[in-house]
Interface confidence: low
């Protein structure tokens, strides 16, 4: 646990905005203590759903009756700590993150249920819960040990629009192919019927008496 004196984080809440170098974090964690440390617990491991949603509980041992609490989620990767999101709430009220935040949450007593959305495999990492009891004094700060969030990317699903384009292209191709095939076969048939015709028709005497051509349909026996 570490205390940041009376510094209050007026962090901007846009996504992953601030990246602190490790040296700065080290400095912050070992500033002379002007405040009181508080125990924060969070699960060691959480698995994100296939839709990239991870939920975990951040629980703090509140030493007093705080009315204003600030919760910050930090992501630690390699030597850098990045702020993912933050929210300040009044005890008994809903936790409100910015509209464009990837985090949502609910509070219940000393528990904050945090949900991070839109996670991808590259977002796998250690997510640290930081809780600050802002009001009334004294100021308390607690930093959890972090929750390792594992994220797997689901098998990529082809875009439905893309599929429609493929379908249109294939059907168009097939249409033109059948059109071409029909045209070629028709021209071949015509060539076979009238070899070297000059385009002048001469009435010829019939070789057989003219009569109705008999059409013999196929006989399909029905049992």
């Amino acid at each position: 646990m570490a205390c940041l004196g009376f510094q209050r984080h007026k962090a901007q809440l846009n996504l992953a905005t601030r990246t602190w170098p490790c040296t700065l974090l080290f400095f912050l964690l070992f500033i002379p203590v002007f405040c009181k440390a508080m125990h924060v617990a969070q699960p060691a491991v959480v698995l994100a759903s296939s839709r990239g949603i991870a939920s975990f509980v951040c629980e703090y041992a509140s030493p007093g009756k705080a009315t204003e609490v600030r919760v910050t989620v930090l992501r630690q990767a390699d030597s850098q700590v990045t702020e993912v999101c933050a929210a300040t709430y009044m005890m008994g009220n809903e936790l409100t993150f910015l509209d464009d935040s990837i985090c949502t949450g609910t509070s219940s007593g000393n528990q904050v249920n945090l949900t991070i959305q839109g996670l991808r495999a590259m977002d796998t990492g250690l997510y640290i819960c930081k809780v600050e009891l802002m009001y009334p004094p004294p100021y308390y700060l607690g930093i959890g040990n972090g929750t390792q969030i594992y994220v797997i990317d689901p098998e990529p699903c082809p875009d439905s629009d893309f599929l429609l384009w493929i379908l249109a292209a294939v059907s168009s191709g097939l249409f033109f192919y059948s059109f071409l095939l029909t045209a070629v076969s028709l021209s071949k048939m015509l060539k076979k019927r009238s070899p070297l015709t000059t385009g002048v028709y001469v009435k010829m005497p019939p070789t057989e008496p003219e009569c109705e051509k008999q059409f013999q349909p196929y006989f399909i026996p029905i049992n």
């Epitope: 617990a41 699960p43 060691a44 491991v45 698995l47 759903s49 040990n145 797997i152």
Partner: antibody, heavy 124, light 112 residues
């Protein structure tokens, strides 16, 4: 050094109780759960139950319900497993194993750290 | 309870050769989050079990890359690309989807 150190071997009579301890060191005890797994001589592994080192939530195997109690002492980072009304078929090596589930019952993931085991012999 | 069935019971291997162990569960271990809740453990003679593979195919830290896990749903396989003498012992699969957590009967790998 990250480890789970278990108490020594025990010999008990049928009907008696046994309490096995498992002391964690090298990691934050309350960030994990502790499972107990036993192995009868020459047999496979059998899961007995789980306890959250964070808040004491438990989940016991139905087969042992009523006979087993799992507890933790966060001040000493120690987990305990007590088995009552011992029978001869309770003779086994009892292992404690760390699990990343801390606060909720339900889905578990893996046991990444095991104790060396405690042999409990039940014999008249 | 979910029943875990392993095969073969015994597997004599030659060092340097590959080996494969199968594990089948009585119901699917695929969670809606996309993970298969199946782990593989190795218990070397006279030792505690040690984690090899978790969530179906993830190698635990410190486990040599000759070990790999595959499969989904109800059928899983542990493969050792080139068996080494230190790989002898009993291999167990375990389902971690629901309690009671259950183990397979074990596969004893020994050097020929």
């Amino acid at each position: 050094q990250v480890q789970l150190v278990q108490s020594g071997a025990e010999v008990k009579k049928p009907g008696a109780s046994v309490k096995v301890s498992c002391k964690a060191s090298g990691y934050t005890f309350t960030s994990y759960g502790i499972n107990w797994v036993r192995q009868a001589p020459g047999q496979g592994l059998e899961w007995m139950g789980w306890i959250s080192a964070y808040n004491g939530n438990t989940n016991y195997a139905q087969k042992l319900q009523g006979r087993v109690t799992m507890t933790t002492d966060t001040s000493t980072s120690t987990a305990y497993m007590e088995l009552r009304s011992l029978r001869s078929d309770d003779t086994a090596v009892y292992y404690c194993a760390r699990d990343p589930v801390t606060m909720v019952r339900g889905v578990h993931w893996y046991f990444d750290l095991w104790g060396r085991g405690t042999l409990v012999t039940v014999s008249s | 309870d979910i029943v875990m069935t392993q095969s073969p019971l015994s597997l004599p291997v030659t060092p340097g050769e590959p080996a494969s162990i199968s594990c089948r569960s009585s119901q699917s271990l695929l969670h809606s989050n996309g993970y298969n809740y199946l782990d593989w453990y190795l218990q070397k003679p006279g030792q505690s079990p040690q984690l090899l593979i978790y969530l179906g195919s993830n190698r635990a830290s410190g486990v040599p890359d000759r070990f790999s896990g595959s499969g989904s749903g109800t059928d899983f396989t542990l493969k050792i690309s080139r068996v080494e003498a230190e790989d002898v012992g009993v291999y167990y699969c375990m389902q971690a989807l629901q309690t009671p957590l259950t183990f397979g009967g074990g596969t004893k790998v020994e050097i020929k």
